[in-house]
Interface confidence: low
């Protein structure tokens, strides 16, 4: 799997999970989240050559097409596969609220 | 929806469905498929600015992050959303076989 266990341990130009820390205030302009101040969102990036973690038959076809026609703009893209939620603390007035924001953390990637 | 009805009618630089005809023999080197000779596979391409058909909370966060940090390599990518199968005819020896290849045709796109 193109997850932290594999991607953070190997230097990989192809599609893989990349570390990304997001500071809510600085990076998103969000001032409403009290805790945490930021989080390890991660992201997916890298090339999708033929048969590199292809998600569907179409992405396999597209990567093969791209190998034979590399000048074409049609190629699969490295995107998130498994995502996890993030628990945040924010305030409505003086009342603290705890909420789980779904699909905030990328855990693994795929070529789609 | 970023489908043919919208994308093929509008000139759109952002993430959208793009027409792509694939000739099995010429573009993939596949000689085993007897019919059809090729098919409209389509593909997804284009920019994913903030809130443009974002698939998940993470892709919304990433596009906002990318707006504030445009030099960063972390940004959502335009990928297939809905896919359809393709029915093909091939031969095993002299015996014709009809099979449905799943997820071969892209019908719509999303920013993921």
């Amino acid at each position: 799997a193109l997850d932290a266990a594999y991607c953070f341990r190997n230097v990989q130009d192809n599609c893989c999970l990349r570390p990304l820390y997001i500071d809510f205030k600085r990076d998103l302009g969000w001032k409403w989240i009290h805790e945490p101040k930021g989080y390890n969102a991660n992201f997916c990036a890298g090339a999708c050559p033929y048969l590199w973690s292809s998600d569907t038959q179409h992405s396999r076809v597209l990567s093969l097409y791209n190998t034979i026609n590399p000048e074409a703009s049609a190629s699969p893209c490295c995107v998130s596969q498994d995502l996890e939620p993030l628990t945040i603390l924010y305030y409505i007035g003086k009342t603290p609220k705890i909420e789980q924001l779904s699909n905030m953390i990328v855990k693994s990637c795929k070529c789609s | 929806a970023l489908d043919a009805a919208y994308c093929f009618r509008n000139v759109q630089d952002n993430c959208c469905l793009r027409p792509l005809y694939i000739d099995f023999k010429r573009d993939l080197g596949w000689k085993w498929i007897h019919e059809p000779k090729g098919y409209n596979a389509n593909f997804c391409a284009g920019a994913c600015p903030y809130l443009w058909s974002s698939d998940t909370q993470h892709s919304r966060v990433l596009s906002l992050y990318n707006t504030i940090n445009p030099e960063a390599s972390a940004s959502p990518c335009c990928v297939s959303q809905d896919l359809e199968p393709l029915t093909i005819l091939y031969y095993i020896g002299k015996t014709p076989k009809i099979e449905q290849l799943s997820n071969m045709i892209v019908k719509s796109c999303k920013c993921s």
């Epitope: 990036a45 090339a47 050559p49 990567s63 026609n69 000048e71 074409a72 893209c77 | -």
Partner: antibody, heavy 125, light 112 residues
């Protein structure tokens, strides 16, 4: 910095062979397609062929058969093997990478960038 | 195979004045926009100016612009500067052609 540097050029007799090397740095050959382009003295540019990141080589129709492109990703090098050389093959030979848009191979559009400085091949007796 | 014809062969221009180079392809370039423009100064390798018919490469001055689609393309320099002297080449990308790429014959831009 992403760079390409050609080597192996020089004087060769007609009918002879020569292997040019293109050493790349700052990027991986598993993610990028590399082209060979030549330029005869005082003439225009002529595309020879490329080797894709997937390892497939393609050639201009005139180059097919006499010219072979290969690569060694571990050595970060692309090669151009030239056989049965003729006087008209005298040229500066460049290697050039396919540009990528947005960090993925999403369309090079005949866009070659960056280029190496070139290496001169002279075919003469 | 495709042939790219550039006109004029030579273009003597006054400093500060505009210059225009035409590039005509014997067949449509792939996707109607797979055309690039290169500048080559004496003793140097070519430098990519424009790709996708009209997209300026990073670091290229905005006095350069590209236009056109299909078979007819134009490179314009709005105000020629001394550093613009050199030979300009167009290059097209083609699909289903035995020659994937073709270069134009070049146009020499010099100061009057």
């Amino acid at each position: 910095e992403q760079q390409l540097v050609e080597s192996g050029g020089g004087l060769v007799q007609p009918g002879g062979s020569l292997r040019l090397s293109c050493a790349v740095s700052g990027f991986s050959l598993s993610s990028y397609t590399v082209n060979w382009v030549r330029q005869a003295p005082g003439k225009g540019l002529e595309w020879i062929g490329y080797i894709s990141y997937g390892g497939s080589a393609y050639y201009a129709s005139w180059a097919n058969g006499r010219f072979t492109i290969s690569k060694d990703s571990a050595k970060n090098s692309v090669y151009l093997q030239m056989n049965s050389l003729r006087a008209e093959d005298t040229a500066v030979y460049f290697c050039a990478r396919h540009m990528q848009v947005g960090g993925a191979p999403t369309g090079s559009m005949a866009a070659f960038d960056p280029w190496g400085p070139g290496t001169l091949v002279t075919v003469s007796s | 195979d495709a042939v790219l014809t550039q006109t004029p062969l030579s273009s003597p221009v006054t400093l500060g004045q505009p210059a225009s180079i035409s590039c005509q392809s014997s067949q449509s370039v792939y996707n109607n926009n797979y055309l690039s423009w290169f500048q080559q100064r004496p003793g140097q390798p070519p430098r990519l100016l424009i790709y996708g018919a009209s997209t300026l490469t990073s670091g290229v001055p905005d006095r350069f612009s590209g236009s056109g689609a299909g078979t007819d393309f134009t490179l314009k320099i709005s105000r020629v500067e001394a550093e613009d002297v050199g030979v300009y080449y167009c290059a097209g990308g083609y699909s289903g052609s035995s020659d994937k790429y073709a270069f134009g014959g070049g146009t020499k831009v010099e100061i009057k």
